[in-house]
C-alpha cells in the first residue's frame, strides 16, 4: 500500500509519525493545491496546525484582502497562513481554536475555543465559535456572534469607521471589538494606551499590546 | 505618547462639590470622545459621563443626571467633570478614558468600556461628613 504523502492539516503530519515541531506541506481538501504551515507536535499532545502567529514585529499585518486570503509572512516566525484554506479546513470537519498569549510581565494565557470554523469567502469568511475554555478571560474577546472578517481594502465590520484602517490589521471586527491579535506591533514600555496594538480585552484589558500571539488549530477529536 | 491626566479629586461634604480635570496629551480632543468612569472598593468600573468635542455630543449615567456636567477646552486639550450635590456614594476613583470618536457602531451613540483603549491613572473622590 503506498504510504500517504499529502496532509491535510498537522494532526495528520503527526498522526503519520512526523513528531518534530517545524514546517510542513499541507494540501487543501480535495485538491492539489499545496501550503506550507508551522505544525506545533509538542504543545498540548501536538497535532497543531498553527495560523497566526506574532512575536517581533518583523512582519506588516496590514495587508489587503487578497493577501489575508491566500496568507503571508514567514511560517517559521511570524504568519498568517489564509483565510481561504483555513475555511475549507474547518468546514471539512470539527476544529477546536486554541490562542496562545505572552504579554510583557512574562505571563501567558490562553482561550481554547470547542468549536470554530470559518465562512466561505462568499461570507466574509465569518468566524464562528463555541465553547470558551481557558485562562485568557472568561468572556471572548473575540466578539459574540462571530463578525465577517475586514481589511484595509475589505470593510465589513459594525462601526461607521473603517476598523481595520482605524486599528490597522485584518480581523474579524465589530466596532471595532474588544480584540485584535494583527495590531500594529509595540515594544516593551512602549505598549500600553494603545488604540491600534495587539489587543485582548478580556485578559489584560484596554490599550495593552501583547508581546506574543498564537493561533492554533487542530481536530476536535484529535 | 497618548497620556491622560486627571486632578482635582478630594474630600468632600455630602452636598458639596469638586471639579475633575483629564488633561490628555499625545492626541487633540477633535477626534476623540473623552469618558469619565469610576470604581468603588470592591465594584465594578462604571460609566459616569462621556463627551465628544467634535459634536459637542454627551452622555451622563442616569445615576448623576443633573448633578454632574462633563465638558471640554480643546485649547487646552482638557475635560472637564463637574460634580455637584455629592452624595456619599459617588465615593470613588475617578478615570478619564479616550476612544476614538468614529469608532461607534451603527445606530449607537457611546461607546462600550473595552472601547477605550487609552486610561488615566485615577483621582479619588471621598465624600464624606
Known amino acids: 500500500k503506498e504510504e500517504q504523502i499529502s496532509f491535510r492539516d498537522c494532526a495528520e503530519v503527526f498522526k503519520s509519525g512526523h513528531t518534530t515541531n517545524g514546517i510542513y506541506t499541507l494540501t487543501f481538501p480535495n485538491s492539489t493545491e499545496e501550503i506550507k504551515a508551522y505544525c506545533d507536535m509538542e504543545a498540548g499532545g501536538g497535532g497543531w496546525t498553527i495560523i497566526q502567529r506574532r512575536e517581533d514585529g518583523s512582519v506588516d499585518f496590514q495587508r489587503t484582502w487578497k493577501e489575508y486570503k491566500v496568507g503571508f509572512g514567514n511560517p517559521s516566525g511570524e504568519y498568517w497562513l489564509g483565510n481561504e484554506f483555513v475555511s475549507q479546513l474547518t468546514n471539512q470537519q470539527r476544529y477546536v481554536l486554541k490562542i496562545h498569549l505572552k504579554d510583557w510581565e512574562g505571563n501567558e494565557a490562553y482561550s481554547l475555543y470547542e468549536h470554530f470554523y470559518l465562512s466561505s469567502e462568499e461570507l466574509n469568511y465569518r468566524i464562528h465559535l463555541k465553547g470558551l475554555t481557558g485562562t485568557a478571560g472568561k468572556i471572548s474577546s473575540i466578539s459574540q456572534p462571530g463578525n465577517d472578517f475586514s481589511t484595509k481594502d475589505g470593510d465589513n465590520d459594525k462601526c461607521i469607521c473603517k476598523c481595520s484602517q482605524m486599528l490597522t490589521g485584518g480581523w474579524w471586527f465589530d466596532a471595532c471589538g474588544p480584540s485584535n491579535l494583527n495590531g500594529m506591533y509595540y515594544p516593551q514600555r512602549q505598549n500600553t494606551n494603545k488604540f491600534n496594538g495587539i489587543k485582548w480585552y478580556y485578559w489584560k484589558g484596554s490599550g495593552y499590546s501583547l508581546k506574543a500571539t498564537t493561533m492554533m488549530i487542530r481536530p476536535a477529536d484529535f | 505618547d497618548v497620556q491622560l491626566v486627571e486632578s482635582g479629586g478630594g474630600l468632600v461634604q455630602p452636598g458639596g462639590s469638586l471639579r475633575l480635570s483629564c488633561a490628555a496629551s499625545g492626541f487633540t480632543l477633535d477626534d476623540y470622545a473623552i469618558g469619565w468612569f469610576r470604581q468603588a472598593p470592591g465594584k465594578e468600573r462604571e460609566g459616569v459621563s462621556a463627551?465628544?468635542?467634535?459634536?459637542?455630543?454627551?452622555y451622563y449615567a442616569d445615576s448623576v443626571k443633573g448633578r454632574f456636567t462633563i465638558s471640554s477646552d480643546n485649547s487646552k486639550n482638557t475635560v472637564y467633570l463637574q460634580m455637584n450635590s455629592l452624595r456619599p456614594e459617588d465615593t470613588a476613583v475617578y478615570y478619564c478614558?479616550?476612544?476614538?470618536?468614529?469608532?461607534?457602531?451603527?445606530?449607537?451613540?457611546?461607546?462600550?468600556?473595552?472601547?477605550?483603549?487609552?486610561w488615566g491613572q485615577g483621582t479619588l473622590v471621598t465624600v464624606s461628613s
Open positions: 463627551i465628544r468635542s467634535s459634536g459637542g455630543s454627551t
Open positions: 478614558a479616550a476612544v476614538p470618536a468614529g469608532r461607534l457602531r451603527f445606530g449607537e451613540q457611546w461607546y462600550p468600556l473595552y472601547e477605550y483603549d487609552a
